[in-house]
């Protein structure tokens, strides 16, 4: 581990309330597949233990979802990834839309802190997929 | 390569087939860009050679595809990557639907066990593109 | 450093006059996230320093977009990255199209070597949002 | 065996429209498309349009005014009709099934064709 | 419309020869990784057969003595060794966009 080797992959465990857009994961071999070595989960959301460049990545389908489903409502789906704690360091890393498309997947380089608290928000009514290979979150420590 | 840097990138050889809903893979610097160190190909799938955890992607582009084209038949094109054997392993590890789109590309973390074979199946009846910059797999091992 | 651990992340600066596909990059902390440790960047255009294997990554959003504005368009919005100089080298490495989507995002591995530059081709007639979280484009080198 | 039967008539009135029936067996409608072809000793063979499993039609431009395929999928059954018929219409119209492969447009069985002579 | 030219038109073969039919496209229908041309075979009366697909892949229960090749704008049907079965008209076509275009054909007889 003194290698800085963190390195995460989270499933879907729920939505949060209505108010709440944010996602809600869970990780570990009694699970499946997902896993956590270096990073903690605080109530749902991903923090990391270790500075230096990560690549996040994810991928988020919607659930029942046809090509339809996403153009069918009013406000579109987005899905944000962002540093949501400290307040200090709150950033938006990734953004993506469904545009009549039921699966956004994406990936990039980011620096980030020990501490840095990781939010994924999904904006819009429709509820994400649960199955562990359709919706997934992770980080990967690459560098100091 | 004691280092445990296993990777390799694939390109597209063929499909199956009409049964068989595997894609068949190739690699090596006479075919482009495409190369295997540490992993192997058996019969066109993907077979890993040492423990780790891995970042699996894919990216596979529908031949001559318009956004009309997948919207066109009545099934669903998906493609789905995982391990297909040793049996007792088998598992989905990541699964996308072309949605009025006609290219889909993911990655994930994922544990992968020396022995393990890769299969990558795409359900439906639409041909993918063997353009070595449209359709692409590859794995590369970023920690014990 | 001599670890080979070379990385950059990159944000939108500009587009390219009108016969010029290319989309023009730029790095630094001073500009938020992004950073170049390692490669360097060539009139926005971005050029590796040591030769390896790398991930190389990139997501593009299309600015003010909705699922009707791709295919409202006449012709294909296509994104390449590619080896664009030296010439002898020139290929296309990683190639999407927008179909009724906003955004594509993908990653592949590839062999570069030490003076390659890359270029991000856009072709049709739309434009590429500059938000740092919707338009980025990276490398990684994983291996030698 | 996979099969494709074609019923119509044979004679038909200029300005007239032409209807067609290709019954399929052994494979399913939702999952193959099926397209429609003409052949003349004058233009040779010529392709018009075909329907595919989701429903969905593509035509040549050149028949897009005036040929309609539709199909019902629980009776087997594809539609081909064609409005405003002249005498340079007489041909052989087939029906054929797209190959396995939705983007590949090769059509691997074909019907007995339907001879079609336009004229008063 | 992308337009085949198929030459010859006729095409006088011995038995157990070659016969060496070529079709043209005014532009490529190479696309994807591979090449959207078909071969089609057909007899008085009866309506045409599926030979080869993409250029070079026999349909099931083709004989082995048909090959395609090519790619871009140049395709080429082979049939070696010709049998007396083999006369026909022979006709490729193109799938690379819509319309769907087939070549004016090829009549194989034997001499």
């Known amino acids: 581990e003194s290698l800085g080797w963190d390195i995460a992959e989270l499933q879907l465990n729920h939505t949060g309330p209505q108010q709440d857009p944010r996602l809600y994961w869970q990780g570990g071999p009694a699970l499946g597949r997902s896993f956590l070595r270096g990073p903690e989960l605080d109530k749902g959301q991903l923090r990391i233990r270790r500075d230096g460049i990560y690549m996040v990545h994810i991928q988020v389908t919607l659930a029942i979802c046809s090509s339809t489903s996403t153009s069918r409502h009013h406000h579109p789906t987005t899905l944000a990834v962002g540093i949501c704690s400290p307040a200090s360091r709150s950033i938006s890393l990734l953004r993506l839309s469904f545009h009549q498309g039921c699966t956004i997947a994406s990936q990039r380089l980011t620096p980030l802190a020990r501490g840095d608290t990781l939010c994924t928000n999904l904006t819009g009514t429709l509820l994400p997929s649960r199955n562990t290979d359709e919706t997934f979150f992770g980080v990967q420590w690459v560098r100091p | 390569e004691s280092l445990g840097w296993d990777i390799a990138e694939l390109q597209l050889n063929h499909t199956g087939p009409q049964q068989d809903p595997r894609l068949y893979w190739q690699g090596g610097p006479a075919l482009g860009r495409s190369f295997l160190r540490g992993p192997e190909l058996d019969k066109g799938q993907l077979r890993i050679r040492r423990d780790g955890i891995y970042m699996v992607h894919i990216q596979v582009t529908l031949a001559i595809c318009s956004s009309t084209s997948t919207s066109r038949h009545h099934h669903p094109t998906t493609l789905a990557v995982g391990i297909c054997s040793p049996a007792s392993r088998s598992i989905s590890l990541l699964r996308l639907s072309f949605h009025q789109g006609c290219t889909i590309a993911s990655q994930r973390l994922t544990p992968l066990a020396r022995g393990d074979t890769l299969c990558t199946n795409l359900t439906g009846t639409l041909l993918p593109s063997r353009n070595t910059d449209e359709t692409f797999f590859g794995v590369q091992w970023v920690r014990p | 450093e001599s670890l080979g651990w070379d990385i950059a992340e990159l944000q939108l600066n500009h587009t390219g006059p009108q016969q010029d596909p290319r989309l023009y990059w730029q790095g630094g902390p001073a500009l938020g996230r992004s950073f170049l440790r390692g490669p360097e960047l060539d009139k926005g255009q971005l050029r590796i320093r040591r030769d390896g294997i790398y991930m190389v990554h990139i997501q593009v959003t299309l600015a003010i977009c909705s699922s009707t504005s791709t295919s409202r368009h006449h012709h294909p919005t296509t994104l390449a990255v590619g080896i664009c100089s030296p010439a002898s080298r020139s290929i296309s490495l990683l190639r999407l199209s927008f179909h009724q989507g906003c955004t594509i995002a993908s990653q592949r591995l590839t062999p570069l070597a030490r003076g390659d530059t890359l270029c991000t081709n856009l072709t049709g007639t739309l434009l590429p949002s500059r938000n740092t979280d919707e338009t980025f484009f990276g490398v990684q080198w994983v291996r030698p | 065996q996979v099969q494709l039967k074609q019923s119509g008539p044979g004679l038909v009135q200029p300005s007239q429209s032409l209807s067609i029936t290709c019954t399929v067996s052994?494979?399913?409608?939702?999952?193959?498309?099926v397209h429609w072809v003409r052949q003349s000793p004058g233009k040779g063979l010529e392709w018009l349009g075909v329907i595919w499993g989701g429903g969905y039609t593509d035509y040549n431009a050149a028949f897009i005014s005036r040929l309609t395929i539709s199909k019902d999928n629980s009776k087997s059954q594809v539609f081909f009709k064609m409005n405003s018929l002249q005498a340079d219409d007489t041909a052989i119209y087939y029906c054929?099934?797209?190959?396995?492969?939705?983007?590949?447009?090769?059509?691997?069985?074909w019907g007995q064709g339907t001879s079609v002579t336009v004229s008063s | 419309d992308i337009v085949l030219t198929q030459s010859p038109a006729s095409l006088p073969v011995s038995l157990g020869q070659r016969a060496t039919i070529s079709c043209r496209a005014n532009?490529?229908?190479?696309?994807?990784?591979?090449?959207?041309m078909h071969w089609y075979q057909q007899k008085p009366g009866q309506p045409p057969k599926l030979l080869i697909y993409l250029a070079s892949n026999l349909d099931s229960g083709v004989p082995a003595r048909f090959s395609g090749s090519g790619s871009g704008t140049d395709f080429t049907l082979n049939i070696h060794p010709v049998e007396e079965e083999d006369t026909a008209t022979y006709y490729c076509q193109h799938s690379r966009e819509f319309p769907l275009t087939f070549g004016a054909g090829t009549k194989l007889e034997l001499k």
């Open positions: 054929a099934r797209n190959n396995y492969y939705g983007n590949l447009y090769a059509m691997d069985y």
């Open positions: 052994n494979f399913s409608l939702s999952t193959y498309g």
């Open positions: 532009k490529s229908v190479s696309a994807s990784g591979y090449s959207f």
